[in-house]
């Protein structure tokens, strides 16, 4: 008996061939001996089976002695033995229909679990192997689970169902709902305008939800909500915003926030959360603001940074085109009695400058100028 594997929702074509290459009498029936379809000359007749409106053949092939049974929009319950009777011979084909579906939705939040469930006909014992877009293989029986979905898990999952040495392949598109970056740092000089961007790592036709940015300033004892907003069909509308600082928000995606000026009291870290409609859980993106200030007070030239900096960052003060006068893994450096000229304050990481602020030191009889 020939075995054919089919996929739920797909179309399958079961073949039946006669020795005579001409249109002759044939019919297909199921294991319950119920007629599915047959021919009357060059015309097709349909039996009373439950397949009725989904069963078909190819009349164009009959003259070549081929009498296929085509079953459209396959259901698991179509799994059966189908018998083609042509001339005085019987051809039996066992059709096994499988379905593979994602637990609840194919759009899942980062960190959530993905469960793939295999629907299979009674009596079958298939094995399933799935390969994620990042090349990770998982194996299982009726269910396969992947916990803690990552952004790289977005894309097409290819699953192979194996039964009776035959295989059928399923492709499931999974969208991991996340921000493109889990965390970002913005480095600004005091007084500069700050732009925070929160690009999403996915695109959907309609995006509805609500969000909030909580901010923990380095100098503050507790965090506070800077802004709350709604998202409706990709349109952003601000619900509530603090007066200090007074953030501005873009009306379209990607989510975009503007802080009029970087000030030491704003330096710190924030957490933008986005709750999407019909989804349990929230998307998160951490954002950090580092603010630099260079000042000269009497005979002291000081450079300071506020905000979350890593211990390996180097803060330096140097006279233009000269070696650094002072360089430390600290958040403040200073030079006493700096010589006149353009001084640079640099925040760097392994030689890469992240932030720089220039300050002009005038000869001692005059006051300093900050460009």
């Amino acid at each position: 008996k020939k075995v054919v594997l089919g996929k739920k929702g797909d179309t399958v074509e079961l073949t039946c061939t006669a020795s005579q290459k001409k249109s002759i009498q044939f019919h297909w029936k199921n294991s319950n001996q119920i007629k599915i379809l047959g021919n009357q000359g060059s015309f097709l007749t349909k039996g009373p089976s439950k397949l009725n409106d989904r069963a078909d053949s190819r009349r164009s092939l009959w003259d070549q002695g081929n009498f296929p049974l085509i079953i459209k929009n396959l259901k698991i319950e179509d799994s059966d033995t189908y018998i083609c009777e042509v001339e005085d011979q019987k051809e039996e084909v066992q059709l096994l229909v499988f379905g593979l579906t994602a637990n609840s939705d194919t759009h899942l939040l980062q960190g959530q679990s993905l469960t793939l469930t295999l629907e299979s006909p009674p009596g079958s014992s298939p094995s399933v192997q799935c390969r994620s877009p990042r090349g990770k293989n998982i194996q299982g029986g009726k269910t396969l689970s992947v916990s803690q979905l990552e952004l790289q898990d977005s894309g097409t999952w290819t699953c192979t169902v194996l039964q009776n040495q035959k295989k059928v392949e399923f492709k499931i598109d999974i969208v991991v709902l996340a921000f493109q970056k889990a965390s970002s740092i913005v480095y600004k000089k005091e007084g500069e305008q700050v732009e925070f961007s929160f690009p999403l790592a996915f695109t959907v036709e309609k995006l509805t939800g609500s969000g909030e940015l909580w901010w923990q300033a380095e100098r503050a004892s507790s965090s506070k909500s800077w802004i709350t907003f709604d998202l409706k069909n990709k349109e952003v509308s601000v619900k509530r915003v603090t007066q200090d600082p007074k953030l501005q928000m873009g009306k379209k995606l990607p989510l975009h926030l503007t802080l009029p000026q970087a000030l030491p009291q704003y330096a710190g870290s924030g957490n933008l959360t986005l709750a999407l409609e019909a989804k349990t859980g929230k998307l998160h993106q951490e954002v950090n603001l580092v603010v630099m200030r260079a000042t000269q007070l009497q005979k002291n030239l000081t450079c300071e940074v506020w905000g979350p900096t890593s211990p390996k960052l180097m803060l330096s003060l140097k006279l233009e085109n000269k070696e650094a006068k002072v360089s430390k893994r600290e958040k403040a450096v200073w030079v006493l009695n700096p010589e006149a000229g353009m001084w640079q304050c640099l925040l760097s990481d392994s030689g890469q400058v992240l932030l720089e602020s220039n300050i002009k030191v005038l000869p001692t009889w005059s006051t300093p100028v900050q460009p």
């Epitope: 002759i24 009498q25 019919h27 029936k29 001996q33 007629k35 047959g38 009357q40 000359g41 060059s42 015309f43 097709l44 007749t45 349909k46 039996g47 009373p48 009725n52 009349r59 009777e85 042509v86 001339e87 005085d88 019987k90």
Partner: antibody, heavy 118, light 111 residues
């Protein structure tokens, strides 16, 4: 020329069975399906079932599946229909029929009258 | 099962005039460009005679006075001009799916 010759009229008692025949000639018997149709006096036509003469498989109208049994004898080109547990409702003319090159029943037997009476 | 409704139940037409009989199916009987509707004529004591198959095809040996038309669920048999010998009962029948079903018939009388 295609010809379907049906058996003689039958007078049978209620509860009994009857087996009628339809002899085909003028064509290759196994190339066409034989259908059976019932017509009560002054009434319409009802399809009972069909026999695929090549394989011998028969399919029935749900209404007649416990009433009729269709068989064929390929060697003698004869199709048979047996009706069981007869009642007055089964009194009718029974036709065998074969399709032509189209979708309709182009060739008919002359009919076998079955009368069920005590 | 597909139910066929034929109208009128009886019809009297003058010799030489047109007789029109309609047949309505409870669902479409079209498949792959063909309409699986047939028309028969039956005279008392005789088996039915196939006139039209696949809605509009004239069976061989049937006069061209008989024409069939329609598709989907609505079909018509026309006889023009009617002749004396056309007095009979006419049936439509679908062969789209099993069980094939017949309508109740139309008795045609020639005046």
């Amino acid at each position: 020329m295609v010809h379907l010759q049906e058996s003689e009229p039958e007078l049978v008692k209620p509860g009994a069975s009857v087996k009628m025949s339809c002899k085909a000639s003028g064509y290759t018997f196994t190339d066409y399906v034989i259908n059976w149709v019932k017509q009560r006096t002054g009434q319409g036509l009802e399809w009972i079932g069909e026999t695929y003469t090549g394989s011998g498989s028969s399919y029935y109208n749900e209404k007649f599946k416990d009433k009729a049994t269709l068989t064929v004898d390929k060697a003698s080109n004869i199709a048979y229909m047996q009706l069981s547990s007869l009642t007055s409702e089964d009194s009718a003319v029974y036709f065998c029929a074969r399709r032509g090159k189209g979708t309709g029943f182009a060739f008919w037997g002359q009919g076998t009258l079955v009368t069920v009476s005590a | 099962d597909i139910v066929l409704t034929q109208s009128p139940a009886s019809l009297a037409v003058s010799l030489g005039q047109r007789a029109t009989i309609s047949c309505k199916a409870s669902q479409s009987v079209d498949y792959d460009g063909d309409s699986y509707m047939n028309w028969y004529q039956q005279k008392p004591g005789q088996p039915p005679k196939l006139l039209i198959y696949a809605a509009s095809n004239l069976e061989s040996g049937i006069p061209a006075r008989f024409t069939g038309s329609g598709s989907g669920t609505d079909f018509t048999l026309n006889i023009h001009p009617v002749e004396e010998e056309d007095t009979a009962t006419y049936y439509c029948q679908q062969s789209y799916e099993d069980p094939p079903t017949f309508a109740g018939g139309t008795n045609l009388e020639i005046k």
